[in-house]
């Protein structure tokens, strides 16, 4: 008789999840000399230990502490790029501007990027059929708690000027319910962070509005100011040219802007 299995609303664990995590860890540590000391088998064991045999709606930040400890990494605190709902452009940017880092440019972010995982209470099995959805099932699921944990730590590490890329095509350019809005904003340290600079990315040539005047951006400014951190905002009207100019900053077309 097949054993009854909890049916969750979200997609199941990404296929070949253990192999993917291990392979990503090996690749990352090969590319980043400062992380060559990391034992990837231990990293996988700690990752697995955070959710295997645990109820997938009962995961805590403490469950991930062994993994956090193994993945401890120092990135230049003044070169941090946060993002919300515009991951691809943020990653394209840091692939060119190699001295800036998104969370997914760190080992732990790289390991988990675009992956889903969960286990089952009292069994060592990984659930490849379904995992809890943050809205429909529960917020304390393995994936959500992981990103909340690493995002909090990433924001806490930031200093000086912190940049955030926001999607100007969304109805809520700044969304209080996003990871940026609910976790990162509140964990920037006013003693270390002087300014949060928002880059509002326009969706196309059709939009000539000053999106820095958007009510949700004003809301972000208010939250940040109340935390004694300065706020600045720039419209990026041309994300295509923005990337081109990151690659070729010396071009007169990139330096001629007022």
């Amino acid at each position: 008789v097949p054993r009854w299995r909890q049916q969750w609303s979200g997609p199941g664990t990404t296929k070949r999840f253990p192999e993917t995590v291990l392979a990503r860890c090996v690749k990352y540590t090969e590319i980043h000399p400062e992380m060559r000391h990391v034992d990837c088998q231990s990293v996988w064991d700690a990752f697995k230990g955070a959710f295997i045999s645990k109820h997938p709606c009962n995961i805590t930040e403490e469950d991930y502490q062994p993994l956090m400890k193994l993945g401890t990494q120092t990135v230049p605190c003044n070169k941090i790029l946060l993002w919300s709902r515009i991951k691809d452009l943020a990653h394209q940017f840091t692939q060119v501007q190699r001295d800036m880092f998104t969370l997914e440019d760190t080992l732990l972010g790289y390991l988990a990027d675009d992956l889903t995982w969960c286990g089952e209470f009292n069994t060592s099995k990984i659930n490849y059929q379904s995992c809890p959805d943050w809205r429909k099932d529960c917020s304390n699921n393995p994936v959500s708690v992981f990103w909340k944990t690493v995002s909090r730590r990433f924001a806490e590490a930031a200093c000086d000027v912190v940049h955030v890329m926001l999607n100007g095509s969304r109805s809520k350019i700044f969304d209080k319910n996003s990871t940026f809005g609910s976790v990162e904003v509140h964990n920037l340290q006013p003693e270390k962070v002087q300014t949060l600079e928002a880059w509002v990315i326009h969706g196309g040539r059709e939009d000539s509005r000053d999106l820095c005047q958007d009510p949700t951006i004003k809301e972000l400014e208010s939250i940040i100011s109340k935390r004694n951190i300065q706020f600045s905002c720039k419209n990026i009207y041309r994300p295509d040219k923005f990337l081109q100019c990151v690659k070729n900053p010396e071009d007169s077309s990139c330096t001629s802007e007022i």
């Epitope: 196309g204 040539r205 059709e206 000539s208 509005r209 000053d210 720039k234 419209n235 990026i236 009207y237 041309r238 295509d240 040219k241 923005f242 081109q244 100019c245 070729n248 071009d251 007169s252 077309s253 990139c254 001629s256 802007e257 007022i258």
Partner: antibody, heavy 123, light 107 residues
Framework: EVQLLESGGGLVQPGGSLRLSCAAS????????MSWVRQAPGKGLEWVST????????YYADSVKGRFTISRDNSKNTLYLQMNSLRAEDTAVYYC????????????????WGQGTLVTVSS | EIVMTQSPATLSVSPGERATLSCRAS??????LAWYQQKPGQAPRLLIY???TRATGIPARFSGSGSGTEFTLTISSLQSEDFAVYYC?????????FGQGTKVEIK
């Protein structure tokens, strides 16, 4: 020095086709949106079409939509306008123009213009 | 589409005098407005963008003002080379549109 040189104009019968070219020099062509603007004899200026840096997006005036196609070859620093199903009202001097394509401020005006090429549609 | 209306159609001014050209948009274009000068047989030349910013190499006697729907181009002291046709253009909304032009002629 920025230079834009149009070519390809001439006399064509109604319903006919013509392809205009604009050779650009003196700047990094692939960093700028480019446009065509026309001016009928003795009349004002009319924006015709715009193409973004890499040709990913194109925009047309309603009067030419479905008949004209703007394109570019960044390796040749050249802008094109393929004009099909030409009408008498398309008779004009066609200017190639550069948009400054700013990142941090909106643009959509023309900082450099070619000298134009005359297209005459007549039977 | 946004209709741009320029007035007057023709402006007769003596050299050395001040010329004031108007441009009205059928709906707000914010500050996304440019002014061009065109002389017979020549291509247009950009004078002003962003409603009030002078383009590179444009003399200080040319100034632009306004926002929303009402805009003005002022030539403080007309020189002989300033007699030409002037066009305004909005770039706030597609399609981009030009005014019909104001001809500044010698009085």
């Amino acid at each position: 020095e920025v230079q834009l040189l149009e070519s390809g104009g001439g006399l064509v019968q109604p319903g006919g086709s013509l392809r205009l070219s604009c050779a650009a020099s003196g700047f990094t062509f692939s960093f700028y949106d480019m446009s065509w603007v026309r001016q009928a004899p003795g009349k004002g200026l009319e924006w015709v079409s715009t193409i973004t840096l890499h040709g990913g997006d194109t925009y047309y005036a309603d009067s030419v939509k479905g008949r004209f196609t703007i394109s570019r070859d960044n390796s040749k620093n050249t802008l094109y306008l393929q004009m099909n199903s030409l009408r008498a009202e398309d008779t004009a001097v066609y200017y190639c123009a550069r948009d400054p394509s700013y990142i941090y401020s909106t643009s959509g005006y023309f900082d450099y213009w070619g000298q134009g090429t005359l297209v005459t549609v007549s039977s | 589409e946004i209709v741009m209306t320029q007035s007057p159609a023709t402006l007769s001014v003596s050299p050395g005098e001040r010329a004031t050209l108007s441009c009205r948009a059928s709906q707000s274009v914010s500050s996304n407005l440019a002014w061009y000068q065109q002389k017979p047989g020549q291509a247009p030349r950009l004078l002003i963008y962003g409603a009030s910013t002078r383009a590179t190499g444009i003399p200080a006697r040319f100034s632009g003002s306004g926002s929303g729907t009402e805009f003005t181009l002022t030539i403080s002291s007309l020189q002989s080379e300033d007699f030409a046709v002037y066009y305004c253009q909005q770039y706030n909304n597609w399609p981009w549109t030009f005014g019909q032009g104001t001809k500044v002629e010698i009085k």
